[in-house]
Interface confidence: low
Amino acid sequence: HTAAQDNCTCPTNKMTVCSPDGPGGRCQCRALGSGMAVDCSTLTSKCLLLKARMSAPKNARTLVRPSEHALVDNDGLYDPDCDPEGRFKARQCNQTSVCWCVNSVGVRRTDKGDLSLRCDELVRTHHILIDLRHRPTAGAFNHSDLDAELRRLFRERYRLHPKFVAAVHYEQPTIQIELRQNTSQKAAGDVDIGDAAYYFERDIKGESLFQGRGGLDLRVRGEPLQVERTLIYYLDEIPPKFSMKRLTA
């Protein structure tokens, strides 16, 4: 009995096509773009979501200083190659045979090269820093209330285990959420921090990936938390490899 069964939709991924053609007439949902079957009882991997997005019709002081090795997704959207489990393939190439290596959240971690470029392994992003700026409010949010509400959000909406929310920092108007998840910590069935961060990012932008759900209504003691800017930094278990030219640019 899949989570999609009742009315044959995918609660965790609206970018799917569902039909009762699974075993025993059960509902089965496939991601747009890739056609891969998805598990509707948990978050869909970021790779499949990006692929689906590219296939969809186009519409018009206590704060942490990110490490020198932190990556920001400056390349924007691309149509990724996903492996049979829905993870990003370590090497991504575009239609003009330009290739690059990515981490487990699909962010480029090397200079671009040609088809001879080798990406030996998919390097895991083990630390994600979500940097938010909220709109002005009458006063600062209470830090402990804000902390509890954001932890609750990741725990209840994305079902990310509390151990992976390492910290919530706040210096009005900047909020930072640190997610940490080493390869050794992630057990079977655990939501991946990269997937949770992507769902959160889309929620914050008013582009919820959940089926038929209202947008994210974040409140701290009844006060709306409205985000006006989001920056996400990704730290990999192995530092990225860029040429000096990029680093000094």
Partner: antibody, heavy 120, light 111 residues
């Protein structure tokens, strides 16, 4: 074998505070959230809150915010709950219960309970 | 908070017969991730609650296959086939889709 051993019964006066303990054994204490549940004499169960020992993350039933403080001592695999400004309505049995995320955020093992009586 | 209403309040059955307990929630218990976090516990006299069924229909380890859970959305049922003496006690349903809450309990007695 998973076991949760709670501290003994308490008889306290109104307006005071009490701190009860829950010692865990038979599993990796830091890796499972510990929840606290109250059972009043009418038999009903009320969820108080949880604490995740690994990083101290916690969450509360709104009703118990300010009433209960949850802490842990990882070195002794012990969870604590302190209840403040006690009244006769706080008289109940308090359970600690391990939360099993893989089983859908349910409580798979419970302590034997600590009986609290608030009386002048 | 989500209100969980159990019926009946008490139930007397003969050994070997089937017992059925109903649990209704004031809100739909299907989480946005598609799971339904509805669980059943048994509290035997003088003991703490024990987990029987999690996520509607999954038996916890060591629980007899005489216990089965079913339901969806807001309506759920616990069935006990071939009731045994050790089954007596108070049965609670509970949800953790929202802030966790429990039903008021159903007392199972032996006729």
């Amino acid at each position: 074998e998973v076991q949760l051993q709670q501290s003994g019964p308490e008889l306290v006066k109104p307006g005071t505070s009490v701190k009860m303990s829950c010692k865990a054994s038979g599993y990796s204490f830091a890796d499972y959230s510990m929840n606290w549940v109250r059972q009043s004499h009418g038999n009903s169960l009320e969820w108080i809150g949880y604490i995740y020992p690994n990083n101290g993350a916690s969450g509360f039933n709104q009703k118990f915010k300010g009433k209960a403080t949850l802490t842990v001592d990882k070195s002794s695999s012990t969870a604590y709950m302190e209840l403040h400004s006690l009244t006769s309505e706080d008289s109940a049995v308090y359970y600690c219960a391990r939360e099993q995320d893989n089983s859908g955020y349910c409580f798979d093992y419970w302590g034997q309970g600590t009986s609290l009586t608030v009386s002048s | 908070d989500v209100v969980m209403t159990q019926t009946p309040l008490s139930l007397a059955v003969r050994l070997g017969d089937q017992a059925s307990i109903s649990c209704r929630s004031s809100l739909n218990l299907v989480h946005s991730n598609g799971n339904t976090f509805l669980h059943w516990y048994l509290q035997r006299p003088g003991q703490s609650p024990k987990l029987l069924i999690y996520k509607v229909s999954n038996r916890f380890s060591g629980v007899s296959d005489r216990f089965s859970g079913s339901g969806s959305g807001t309506d759920f049922t616990l069935k006990i086939s071939r009731v045994e003496a050790e089954d007596l006690g108070v049965y609670f349903c509970s949800q953790t889709t929202h802030v966790p809450t429990f039903g008021g309990g159903t007392k199972l007695e032996i006729k």
